[in-house]
Amino acid sequence: KAMHVAQPAVVLANSRGTASFVCEYASPGKATEVRVTVLRQADSQVTEVCAATYMMGNELTFLDDSICTGTSSGNQVNLTIQGLRAMDTGLYICKVELMYPPPYYMGIGNGTQIYVIDPEPCPDSD
């Protein structure tokens, strides 16, 4: 009955500091309310990057000031994290919680290593 969560091992952010990945979960039950949280793990410290609760069949809604956006389709969540810089390189973990109806289930992915390379500044043009 354990809930398994899958996510890619590595993702490279684009030149604008945006990284996208899919978080997929094998649901042991028929959930109608799901919470998805993106966590960043660095030096054994875990911090929340963003979180959204959604009703199955509806869109994910992150807070207005969130750096994340996403869409859902069945047991897949397509997550996009924006505004990343080189210092944000790290392991991003997808946590899925089936909040309703009972029973509650939680699953944690192994994490996606996101690499961010700051773009080189444009040379001055004479």
Epitope: A2, M3, P28, E33, V46, E48, Y105, M106, I108
Partner: antibody, heavy 118, light 108 residues
Amino acid sequence: QVQLVESGGGVVQPGRSLRLSCAASGFTFSHYTMHWVRQAPGKGLEWVTFISYDGHNKYYADSVKGRFTISRDNSKNTLYLQMNSLRAEDTAIYYCARHGWLGPFDYWGQGTLVTVSS
Amino acid sequence: EIVLTQSPGTLSLSPGERATLSCRASQEVGESELAWYQQKPGQAPRLLIYGAFSRATGIPDRFSGSGSGTDFTLTISRLEPEDFAVYYCQQYGSSPWTFGQGTKVEIK
């Protein structure tokens, strides 16, 4: 630093009510799911109830369902446990615990003792 | 409900010895969803291991966790005087959240 402080325990007669509180500090309370766990004298740990970040979702152990109610006030950083129709078997130390980002109960209060006796 | 069974009930060992505690689940537990706690008399439980093998902040490396599926182990490589306590395993992957009945590690 993270701190959880329970209060409200005491001696109460069977059938009576009691409300426990857990004051949280040192973290953003509204971002975390919270739990109550109890421990009868000389016994092991028993999970009692859970409440989600916003208070929307609540789960209870079968042993307390219909008698206990968990709630939270995020503006006051406080977790509550309303215990009604108390029984002798509810006698225990009651701990509030924070549900960590990765799932385990990473911080616990010191506990408050509830004794149900006539 | 996932039932967790710990063995042995009591472990009598001397300081410096190795302690091996077992936790068996009645059904599969995701390896990311098993924790170990330590509890000393008169104190609240303290998180030692989460995700079956990750040490919590500030936990010395003599404590290690292993296992997957239904069988999990907590190992204390060399017992220190402060390690004599009761240890509980817990699954947190589904409700109801359940604990094992505990293993008491006592001084021989």
